[in-house]
Interface confidence: low
């Protein structure tokens, strides 16, 4: 299945963190979502084989990339209290 690290993260405001996602074997697409209490589930970004394919409601302080080995990273910088949320990665062919 899809593997995300870290499972839990506690950090301070203003910090930068990196979330990593390894897609399911055979999958070339990676999707990132944010689920917060006040905003619900929001699509952030979609990569296909290293190429950005679609951008959703992703803040300028957030960036993502997908590497040639297909794993993806979501970078969250200048963190604010409102960034506290569940971050989901999904993959597909």
């Amino acid at each position: 299945g899809v593997t995300q690290t870290p499972k839990h993260l506690i950090t301070a405001t203003g910090q930068r963190v990196t979330l990593r996602c390894s897609p399911r074997s055979g999958d070339l697409s990676v999707y990132w979502y944010q689920q917060s209490l006040d905003q619900g589930l929001q699509f952030l970004i979609h990569y296909y084989n290293g190429e950005e394919r679609a951008k959703g409601n992703i803040l300028e302080r957030f960036s993502a990339q997908q590497f040639p080995d297909l794993h993806s990273e979501l970078n969250l910088s200048s963190l604010e209290l409102g960034d506290s949320a569940l971050y989901f990665c999904a993959s597909s062919v």
Epitope: S25, N49, F67, P68, L70, H71, V93
Partner: antibody, heavy 122, light 107 residues
Framework: QVQLVQSGPELKKPGESVKVSCKAS????????VHWVRQAPGKGLEWMGW????????TYADDFEGRFVFSLDTSASTANLQICSLKNEDTATYYC???????????????WGQGTLVTVSS | DIQMTQSPYSLSASVGDRVTITCKAS??????LAWFQQKPGKPNKLLIY???TLQSGVPSRFSGSGSGTDFTLTISSLEPEDFATYYC?????????FGQGTKLEIK
């Protein structure tokens, strides 16, 4: 420059196992998938699957589930193919190949090893 | 899986000749076709991807064209080092599949 250098030819008996290695150089090994491709004598190329060099996770094509195992020695920038319980029909040249750069659609290969001939005969 | 059919199976030509190899997909693969050159004991060489994009370092006498199901590889003027076997490969969808190869021999 990018190079994939494979181990030498192997002669095995049915039922035995064989391990083919593929040593990468000239690039960051964990940045690119390594694929395996089979070519039986006088036949075309068959994609066997890949190994994710970052996570170590293998992906096998349908026809290569079971007796075929992809593994890594990341410290030596080496990918390995092991075939167990060899059959006569496993006689083939086995190639490793590097996934091409990200941003290109689908699965493709920009650098290949020179091939390793595995002969299975009693 | 998508079936890839190459023709001809083999081809005899002379240095300086213009040769064309064709590849047909069992369903549309858009423009996503690659061509490789194979020589015994040597690593396979990527020539073209995306149907017509020349891989870096590949001589301009090689060109590719086509989209959908029908594709061609053209060598405009054969050099001695071009005598080899050529394979097409679709990279439109999983799993990747190859043509059966075209052996280009010296006449």
């Amino acid at each position: 420059q990018v190079q994939l250098v494979q181990s030498g030819p192997e002669l095995k008996k049915p039922g035995e196992s064989v391990k083919v290695s593929c040593k990468a150089s000239g690039y960051t090994f964990t940045d690119y998938l390594v694929h395996w491709v089979r070519q039986a004598p006088g036949k075309g190329l068959e994609w066997m699957g890949w190994i994710n060099t970052y996570t170590g996770t293998p992906t096998y094509a349908d026809d290569f589930e079971g007796r075929f195992v992809f593994s890594l020695d990341t410290s030596a920038s080496t990918a390995n193919l092991q075939i167990c319980s060899l059959k006569n029909e496993d006689t083939a040249t086995y190639y490793c190949a590097r996934s091409w750069r990200r941003g290109l659609r689908g699965i493709g290969f920009d650098y290949w090893g020179q091939g390793t001939l595995v002969t299975v005969s009693s | 899986d998508i079936q890839m059919t190459q023709s001809p199976y083999s081809l005899s030509a002379s240095v300086g000749d213009r040769v064309t190899i064709t590849c047909k997909a069992s369903k549309s693969i858009n423009k996503y076709l690659a061509w490789f050159q194979q020589k015994p004991g040597k690593p396979n060489k990527l020539l073209i991807y995306d149907g017509s994009t020349l891989q870096s370092g590949v001589p301009s006498r090689f060109s590719g064209s086509g989209s959908g199901t029908d594709f061609t590889l053209t060598i405009s003027s054969l050099e001695p080092e071009d005598f080899a076997t050529y394979y097409c490969q679709q990279h439109n969808e999983y799993p990747p599949t190859f043509g059966q190869g075209t052996k280009l021999e010296i006449k």
